[in-house]
Interface confidence: low
């Protein structure tokens, strides 16, 4: 019944193989997480040698801009003081192409670049065409009226005369294409003539005209090559380390990234901060929940309720005031002084008074809230939809006849969703390298460890069988009780003969990652060996001789 010399040699060889497997598995358990971390840190840096450099330079994610216009249904009634009534039209969808140029690596661990954007209408994804007509407030007229409110009456009367001469009215009927990319307006030429430099438009006025075929300013961001903790954070925008649009240092700060990638190794405690040139401010999104996008683990970040809150509700926003109701942000200081406001679509999360003042608005958390799904390990966005609304504050201004009897109201002009999701080859590569491979490595380390442990038991079993074969029943019983630690054993271990020594300490601890609870592998092995020791002789018909033994 005992093991022959050959069998013992084979058992020894298997034991050695087992030891190697167990040690390799344990080393992997210790080393793999730090190796993965090292690789991530190496490859998320903005460095031509890093894997994500081309992804950073030419974003492979297809972005779409979906625009929804608020078609004014009762312009004549509004001029008589009635409540505005609007109808949402759209979406009018544009494919957005982005590319970085003038990339300059500086010697202070930063890189400067310009990012250009171009938009291409997508008829198949749109609900309507660019030639659709929309009735909307004439921003130039109504904006100028509010701006002139406290100016001398003579000036306002001259303004009324100018508007009349140029055929300008409070509401206009324009095509989607004109509203988006610009329409010729004699008033633009007039403003540029008498107020040079005040207006960013040369001969055409369009809400998105500034964005198409142009850059969003010179960003200087940290590369993370020398200091990974600052990676992607904005150092300067247009040479400024803070802007001067607002009334407090905190509001003027340029915080976070440029809004495309974030530092790696995020936790639920991380926030997502970025500087938005369009909003002329830094924005901070908060962690909401963990999720999965196409098999890739993500953290969802959303806008906190305080994002557009006014100063009385959220004091840190005081610097963005003067404020109207809470939930809308006055962007006039960075939008040629026009009374324009930024908010969530349909005044979601804003003072209910705003949505109630306009018929046809239906704020909905599902449809109108923005989100960014980020892969927490790399800080790379997987799926995002940034939704914002642009509104105009309008009112009747004495002396400017075109404003009639308009009751003060914040009237939504349009809202847009800038959305993108990783797909195709990029997604497949990302999944393989950052989800599948680590998962395979993760399981491999435990499989190796388990296999090693099982192989290590072969010589143990062989030793037990040798003792059984010699017919030493008393010794067998004794050896069995000693194999089970804590059952009468004093100073002997379960490892057989002097040729075997216990495996290294690294193997003797197996920790469940993340929970902070550890179990001794030594006792796990012992109980396993005890079960083998008690069941093997029984299986071989030697039950009665070991009747007194119990497994642990």
């Amino acid at each position: 019944m005992g093991c022959s010399a050959k069998a013992r040699w084979a058992a020894g060889a298997l034991g050695v193989a087992g030891l190697l497997c167990a040690v390799l598995g344990a080393v992997m358990i210790v080393m793999v997480p730090s190796l993965i971390k090292q690789q991530v840190l190496k490859n998320v840096r903005i460095d031509p040698s890093s894997l994500s450099f081309n992804m950073w330079k030419e974003i492979p994610i297809p972005f779409y801009l979906s625009v929804y216009f608020f078609d004014v249904m009762n312009p004549s009634e509004i001029l008589k003081g009635e409540k505005p009534q609007v109808r949402e039209r759209g979406p009018y969808v544009y494919r957005e192409f982005r590319h970085k140029s003038n990339i300059t690596f500086n010697n202070n661990d930063t890189v400067s670049f310009l990012e250009y954007r171009t938009f291409q209408f997508q008829p198949s994804k749109s609900h309507g065409s660019e030639s659709d007509y929309i009735v909307m407030p004439n921003i130039l007229v109504l904006g100028a009226a509010v701006m002139m409110e406290n100016k001398p009456m003579t000036l306002k009367l001259i303004m009324t005369l100018a508007f009349t001469t140029l055929g300008e009215r409070a509401f206009m009927n324009r095509t989607v294409g004109e509203i988006m990319w610009g329409y010729k307006d004699p008033l633009v030429n007039l403003i540029n003539k008498y107020f040079p430099g005040m207006f960013p438009f040369k001969d055409k006025f369009g809400l998105f005209a500034e964005l198409n075929n142009s850059d969003s300013g010179l960003f200087t961001v940290f590369t993370g090559v020398q200091n990974i903790s600052r990676i992607h954070l904005v150092d300067k925008w247009n040479g400024l380390s803070k802007v001067d649009f607002w009334h407090s240092d905190q509001c003027n700060m340029i915080n976070g990234t440029s809004g495309q990638m974030w530092p790696p190794f995020m936790t639920p405690e991380s926030s997502l901060e970025f500087y938005s040139p369009e909003a002329c401010r830094s924005m901070k999104l908060m962690y909401k929940e963990s999720g999965v996008f196409e098999g890739i683990p993500t953290y969802r970040f959303v806008a906190p309720k305080t994002l557009f809150a006014n100063g009385s509700i959220y004091p840190p926003n005081e610097g963005f005031c003067p404020c109207l109701e809470s939930g809308i942000q006055n962007v006039s200081t960075c939008r040629f002084s026009a009374p324009l406001f930024l908010s969530h679509p349909h005044f979601l999360n804003a003072d209910p008074v705003l949505a109630e003042a306009v018929t046809g608005l239906h704020p909905n958390q599902e449809a109108h809230s923005l989100f960014l799904d980020i892969h927490p390990v790399t800080g790379i966005p997987m799926n995002c939809s940034v939704k914002l609304q642009l509104s105009l504050y309008m009112k009747s201004v004495a002396g400017i006849g075109q404003t009639g009897k308009i009751e003060p109201v914040v009237l939504p002009l349009l809202w847009f969703a800038e959305s993108g999701a990783m797909e195709g080859e990029t997604l497949h590569t990302f999944y393989t390298q950052l989800v599948l491979m680590p998962k395979v490595m993760h399981y491999a380390q435990y499989v190796l460890l388990a296999l090693g442990c099982v192989l290590l038991l072969v010589p143990v079993i062989c030793q037990i069988r040798s003792q059984v074969g010699a017919g030493q029943r008393a010794a067998r019983a004794d050896s069995h009780s000693l194999a089970c630690w804590g059952k009468g054993a004093s100073d002997r271990t379960l490892w057989p003969t002097a040729a075997w020594s216990p495996p290294p300490a690294a193997v003797l601890r197996l920790c469940r990652s993340g929970s902070g609870h550890c179990w001794g592998l030594r006792s796990t092995l012992a109980s396993f060996a005890c079960r083998v020791a008690t069941t093997l002789p029984v299986l071989e018909g030697l039950g009665p001789s070991l009747g007194g033994g119990t497994g642990s």
Epitope: T267, E269, S270, M286, P304, G516
Partner: antibody, heavy 119, light 108 residues
């Protein structure tokens, strides 16, 4: 305005169990993590655990693991913390709090529940 | 886990600074928060995200951080500032928040 309303003071004998409550008012309960903290005399504040009422997921500090159970009832917007096998060193003020401003930034606190463990 | 001196004092109008020392797994990795606790009351958030004043906190308070240490400064000390001040940060190894033992401020 978000507020956390805690239950009143409790006196228990060693070995007994105490369950204290914390009701959130003024906003959606499931939008907040509820943290529980212990302020024992001469010991300073210690974090005990937290619950995400959205999915009842809990995390406990290792020191309190096994003796503390945190639960949430979304129908009443209330979180509960039960401490079992009470000892005299559990005599403390127990606070619930939420951290709307991120990592350990507890901007809303309950008034605290005094638990006295005495034979 | 976070270390604070047990007491501090200052005369009205003076400047006083509180220190808070931690490690790489807490202050070294995360932002710091400061709390004020008046006798018999619940703690009140004073500073969050290291240097941001919480709602209602006077601008006499300011916070900063360097490496694994953080500090809170009060300029123009007032009698109503007499309270316990303690720091807090998230801790990776604990997977939860950790607090300092608190510093008792006495206004002379």
């Amino acid at each position: 305005e978000v507020q956390l309303v805690q239950s009143g003071a409790e006196v228990r004998k060693p070995g007994a169990t105490v369950k204290i409550s914390c009701k959130l008012t003024g906003d959606t309960f499931t939008d907040y993590f509820i943290f529980w903290l212990q302020l024992a005399p001469g010991k300073g504040l210690q974090w005990m655990g937290l619950i995400d009422p959205k999915d009842a997921q809990t995390i406990y500090a290792e020191k309190f693991q096994g003796r503390v159970a945190i639960t949430a009832d979304t129908s009443t917007d209330t979180a509960y913390m039960e401490v079992s096998s009470l000892r005299s060193e559990d005599t403390a003020v127990y606070y619930c709090a939420t951290d709307s401003v991120g990592a350990a930034g507890f901007d809303v606190w309950g008034r605290g529940t005094m638990v006295t463990v005495s034979s | 886990v976070l270390t604070q001196p047990p007491s501090a004092s200052g005369a009205p109008g003076q400047r006083v600074t509180f220190s808070c020392s931690g490690s790489g797994s807490n202050i070294g990795s995360y932002t710091v928060n400061w709390y004020q606790q008046l006798p018999g009351a619940a703690p009140r958030l004073l500073m969050h995200t290291t240097d941001q004043r919480a709602s209602g906190a006077p601008d006499r308070f300011s916070g900063s951080k360097s490496g694994t240490s953080a500090s809170l400064a009060i300029t123009g000390l007032q009698s109503e500032d007499e309270a316990d001040y303690f720091c807090a940060a998230w801790d990776d190894s604990l997977d939860g928040p950790v607090f300092g033992g608190g510093t008792k401020l006495t206004v002379l």
